[in-house]
Interface confidence: medium
């Protein structure tokens, strides 16, 4: 439905508060280096303009597209060339090329200082002094560090952030109240950002069809009682929402997400019995709740899939007449019966089925050719099952930190060219699969583990894409979205890798390590471990374990010493020498 003024339409739909917040997020995700004050000024100018269009939709420039209005505004930033270099060239382009250009310059790993949390009293004072600015600053800082963060969901995080400060800044023990809430928001926020990054990568690198297939599988697992046509409707609408958000169209995205939540709640009887509680909540909570809702119970007595998809004489006819709808039905039927499978496994099965039909429907005897197609699924199902079983056993034996270390060694040997910070970050996250998923019963382990690993490996892919250094990573990341994890799992030690020169500086530590949090200290040790493997890729587990145990003992000893710095200097030299000897460096 066309509106005379798109900006007026969105302002009225979303309301001033959400409009301003979403424009701020959009601008911060595009111009990630711009100071907060500059963004606030731009947002205020856009908001004032939007208000004139609400008053008179025929006013000058009100008929312009949002991309044109926002792009024109971003291109007024005086320091664009100095701060962003070639991104400034985007401003010479016309829409829609200009917006595409801005999107291509989004940086998944911007060179921004780590966010340091001030003292609780300092934060509470800032919150009370100017609540609006305090919350805007939160949106800005998260958005610029996570340029693909799902904007309507960030509004939900900001609402919870505000609630935490409102409650805790008047509590007797402010820190005890606030800090766990902020930790939870930080961890959930990182997870949310990574999940959305995979959705955007799926759409942008593999296309709408890939995203829709993912959505059919996931929604069919979640809503197994819904008809195929209903699932298809939800998939179409959800694809539009995510296409918009990933494309920087945050106002449209938030508006359409609200419409989708409204539709789902109005039609919950034909979608899922689990939606009742979600649908009683306010908008932001409602949308979040629907996105996280548990799987509904499977309908009783679902018939065998073989009848329609293997035994029927009409398989090739149905496939030929509407390939994507027939394959969609197959995926829907398989997924609603298998909440115990990961989405990526379901997509592999659908791909195998499609490949078989492509081949067999052109054969002399199609039915004879595809009669055993379901047998081809067995090894595909067993591979992730076995992998998860083995890794959960390893996790239970080692605990999270040592399990992460095992993965660090494994992945550094597979792709030693990747930067050390990326290997540490990705392997630590891969290692978290243990505590996240291994506690679940068998029926929930695979969807938890393999779909989580897809999200983490996508982090590796987007970070590697910025500065590609490994053909093996590029190959696993680009060949097939659903086979990324099996591709990485199948990589062996890279025999072509020339070991890194030994640099004593890499293994020189100072007393500042003693004041670090446990997490930061782990990262320091894991960074050293990666560097060790890069120097000695053929080192055995036993050799590496011995060196790491010595290293842990060295840190513990020096942190207890009276003269810590001297201890680190003298004992550090001995440790480096002993490690070189142990590893034959």
């Amino acid at each position: 439905d066309a509106h005379k003024s798109e900006v007026a339409h969105r302002f009225k739909d979303l309301g001033e508060e959400n409009f301003k917040a979403l424009v701020l997020i959009a601008f911060a995700q595009y111009l990630q280096q711009c100071p907060f004050e500059d963004h606030v000024k731009l947002v205020n100018e856009v908001t004032e303009f939007a208000k004139t269009c609400v008053a008179d939709e025929s006013a000058e420039n009100c008929d312009k597209s949002l991309h044109t209005l926002f792009g024109d505004k971003l291109c007024t930033v005086a320091t664009l060339r100095e701060t962003y270099g070639e991104m400034a060239d985007c401003c010479a382009k016309q829409e829609p090329e200009r917006n595409e250009c801005f999107l291509q310059h989004k940086d998944d790993n911007p060179n921004l200082p780590r966010l340091v949390r001030p003292e609780v009293d300092v934060m509470c004072t800032a919150f009370h002094d100017n609540e609006e600015t305090f919350l805007k600053k939160y949106l800005y800082e998260i958005a610029r560090r996570h340029p693909y963060f799902y904007a309507p969901e960030l509004l939900f995080f900001a609402k919870r952030y505000k609630a935490a400060f409102t409650e805790c800044c008047q509590a007797a023990d402010k820190a005890a109240c606030l800090l766990p809430k902020l930790d939870e928001l930080r961890d959930e926020g990182k997870a949310s950002s990574a999940k959305q990054r995979l959705k955007c990568a799926s759409l942008q690198k593999f296309g709408e069809r890939a995203f829709k297939a993912w959505a059919v599988a996931r929604l069919s697992q979640r809503f197994p009682k819904a008809e195929f046509a209903e699932v298809s409707k939800l998939v179409t609408d959800l694809t539009k929402v995510h296409t918009e958000c990933c494309h920087g169209d945050l106002l449209e995205c938030a508006d359409d997400r609200a419409d989708l939540a409204k539709y789902i709640c109005e039609n919950q009887d034909s979608i899922s019995s689990k939606l009742k509680e979600c649908c009683e909540k306010p908008l932001l909570e409602k949308s979040h709740c629907i996105a996280e809702v548990e799987n509904d119970e499977m309908p009783a007595d679902l018939p065998s899939l073989a009848a329609d998809f293997v035994e029927s004489k009409d398989v090739c006819k149905n496939y030929a007449e509407a390939k994507d709808v027939f394959l969609g039905m197959f995926l829907y039927e398989y997924a609603r019966r298998h909440p115990d499978y990961s989405v990526v496994l379901l997509l592999r099965l659908a791909k195998t089925y499609e490949t078989t039909l492509e081949k067999c429907c052109a054969a002399a005897d199609p039915h004879e050719c595809y009669a055993k197609v379901f047998d081809e699924f067995k090894p595909l199902v067993e591979e992730p099952q076995n992998l998860i079983k083995q890794n959960c056993e390893l996790f239970e034996q080692l605990g999270e930190y040592k399990f992460q270390n095992a993965l660090l060694v494994r992945y550094t040997k597979k792709v030693p060219q990747v930067s050390t910070p990326t290997l540490v970050e990705v392997s630590r996250n891969l290692g978290k699969v243990g505590s996240k998923c291994c506690k679940h019963p068998e029926a929930k382990r695979m969807p938890c583990a393999e779909d989580y690993l897809s999200v983490v490996l996508n982090q590796l892919c987007v970070l590697h894409e910025k500065t590609p250094v490994s053909d093996r990573v590029t190959k696993c990341c680009t060949e097939s979205l659903v086979n990324r994890r099996p591709c990485f799992s199948a990589l062996e030690v890279d025999e072509t890798y020339v070991p890194k020169e030994f640099n004593a500086e890499t293994f020189t530590f100072h007393a500042d390590i003693c004041t670090l949090s446990e997490k930061e200290r782990q990262i320091k040790k894991q960074t050293a471990l990666v560097e060790l493997v890069k120097h000695k890729p053929k080192a055995t587990k036993e050799q590496l374990k011995a060196v790491m145990d010595d290293f842990a003992a060295f840190v513990e000893k020096c942190c207890k010493a009276d003269d810590k710095e001297t201890c680190f200097a003298e004992e550090g030299k001995k440790l480096v020498a002993a490690s070189q000897a142990a590893l034959g460096l």
Epitope: E227, F228, E230, S232, E333
Partner: nanobody, 119 residues
Framework: EVQLLESGGGLVQPGGSLRLSCAAS????????MLWVRQAPGKGLEWVSV????????YYADSVKGRFTISRDNSKNTLYLQMNSLRAEDTALYYC????????????WGQGTLVQVSS
């Protein structure tokens, strides 16, 4: 009792247009996805197009994409199929049906309306 009554068929020249209608009763039309299927003389059933209960999304068989448009008016309990650029191979008996709950079986059928494309 469920009833589906198709109309609008007839004889038309290649390149011409027709609009088929299907009046529904006996079930809650506005919560049912609907489709058009056709059966050419001596051939099996071929599904043509599906429409969700809300009007979007819609799906089309590759053979009719870009030429046919499915639509519905829930206030009138009526399903439509606008057929443009008709070809000889579109000659068939056209049925409207309630979309299957999940599998490939169609729940309810009409009696059909004949479309003949010939010069």
């Amino acid at each position: 009792e469920v009833q589906l009554l198709e109309s609008g068929g007839g004889l038309v020249q290649p390149g011409g247009s027709l609009r088929l209608s299907c009046a529904a009763s006996g079930f809650t039309f506005d919560t049912s996805s609907m489709l058009w299927v056709r059966q050419a003389p001596g051939k099996g059933l071929e599904w043509v197009s599906v429409i969700h209960q809300s009007g979007t999304p819609t799906y089309y068989a590759d053979s009719v994409k870009g030429r046919f448009t499915i639509s519905r008016d829930n206030s009138k309990n009526t399903l439509y199929l606008q057929m443009n650029s008709l070809r000889a191979e579109d000659t068939a008996l056209y049925y409207c049906a309630k979309f299957p709950s999940s599998r490939m079986k169609f729940d309810y059928w009409g009696q059909g309306t004949l479309v003949q494309v010939s010069s």
